[in-house]
């Protein structure tokens, strides 16, 4: 089909400009030279193309760069970034934080979590580690995006950078991510005094082991219930009633509200009922008085 492949002489494109918005898809495909498009990508986002037309331009770039776009093109994608799939982005090598900022601005408020996560991943790979400048950029332009990184990528965060992370940046982090970040935070804040240390370490406590939670219970920190509920189940279960009481301080009354929710429910099931009764909260479900507890897992390990 000649119409598909041949550009009419009067439609030949010598520069990327606003006249192109009047080209049909087929004319864009036939008349826009991919190398010219790549060289003048900085003009594209200022031109009021439809996304239908941007799809054609993307197709041209894909043909020119089957192994992935160079950063000179990526930096100027603008709204064309909304047409990129995670598979497209995985091919990129991005090192510039200006590129990251530009694309985070475009994607702000859109359902692009997979694309943004992949982009951030490529930046971390490109820069070699998750350095302070990258973390600062993420916290400024994409709160919560830190948690889109895999535990493997987060492991490249130097402890010195942890101080730049704000509590809200960790809101969407899962246990596996906090498992990686917590030891770094512990190291980063180790020279702080008790109360100051607790304020800093609190957002990371979802990755804390039992020993560290027990240690906190000796420091009069008065942990709030929200933080307690985010602790790892495995870290909470071995705590005694007395330790939980000291850990929560005046907030211990909140256990009643969370009685049916993990990890509180699971912790109650492991405590003696008469120990729970000492709290005076009416918590029910503990081990009845006079019952013997056999830990079969220990027996199996011995046999």
């Amino acid at each position: 089909d000649v119409e598909r492949t041949t550009c009419p002489p009067e439609k030949e494109v010598h520069e990327i400009d606003e006249s192109l918005i009047f080209y049909k898809k087929r004319e864009l495909e036939a008349c826009v030279d991919a190398a010219l498009l790549a060289a003048q990508m900085d003009r594209v986002d200022a031109i009021p193309f439809t996304y239908e037309q941007l799809d054609v331009l993307k197709h041209k770039l894909d043909e020119l760069y089957p192994q992935g776009y160079p950063e000179s093109v990526i930096r100027h994608l603008g709204h064309l970034f909304l047409k990129m799939s995670p598979e497209d982005i995985r091919k990129w090598n991005v090192t510039s934080l200006e590129t990251l900022k530009a694309l985070l601005k475009v994607s702000k408020g859109h359902e692009m979590s997979a694309q943004v996560a992949t982009l951030i991943d490529r930046v971390v790979v490109g820069r070699g580690q998750l350095d302070k400048d990258t973390v600062d950029t993420l916290t400024a332009f994409c709160p919560g995006c830190l948690c889109s990184l895999s535990p493997e990528r987060l492991s490249s965060v130097p402890p010195s950078v942890i101080g730049a992370v704000r509590p809200q940046d960790l809101d969407t982090c899962g246990p596996r991510q906090l498992d990686v970040l917590y030891p770094k935070a512990r190291l980063a804040f180790q020279n702080m005094s008790g109360s100051e240390y607790f304020v800093k370490i609190r957002p990371f406590l979802g990755g804390a082991p039992t020993e560290d939670v027990k240690a906190l219970s000796q420091q009069n920190v008065s942990m709030d219930l929200a933080t307690f509920m985010k602790l790892r189940r495995e870290a909470v279960l071995p705590l005694t009633v007395a330790e939980v009481q000291k850990l929560l301080g005046p907030h211990v009354e909140g256990l009643k509200v969370e009685e049916q929710h993990s990890p509180v429910r699971d912790w109650i099931l492991k405590q003696r009922q008469d120990d729970l009764d000492t709290l005076g909260l009416g918590l029910q479900g503990g081990i009845p008085n006079g019952y013997l507890i056999l830990d079969l897992s220990v027996r199996e390990a011995l046999s």
Epitope: P48, T50, Y51, E52, L82, E111
Partner: nanobody, 116 residues
Framework: QVQLVESGGGVVQPGGSLRLSCATS????????MGWFRQAPGKQRELVAR???????MYADSVKGRFTISRDNSKNTVYLQMNSLKPEDTAVYYC??????????WGQGTQVTVSS
Amino acid sequence: QVQLVESGGGVVQPGGSLRLSCATSGTIFSRNGMGWFRQAPGKQRELVARILNDGTTMYADSVKGRFTISRDNSKNTVYLQMNSLKPEDTAVYYCGYSDYRGTDYWGQGTQVTVSS
């Protein structure tokens, strides 16, 4: 999602005029203003005129001097005044816009037929 409803199409003789309207069911947040497009049978859709968010207007060479795009923000309506119509202007006319999320929106279209 905001609905786009075109009206004003019809049959007109060469040299005649029509005024198309595009009413939106609410405020639109467009990346590229509002456009009037047309599609003739067997052809691809093409942009005829566009009015950007700042009021700037743009026209295809084939309609310059004959068509005028305008809008009334108080009525959430965009217009296309078409004068000196020619047989080659025969097509289904659509209004449309692109949001900030990666999607184009179109109305259902209104038929314009220029015939003697």
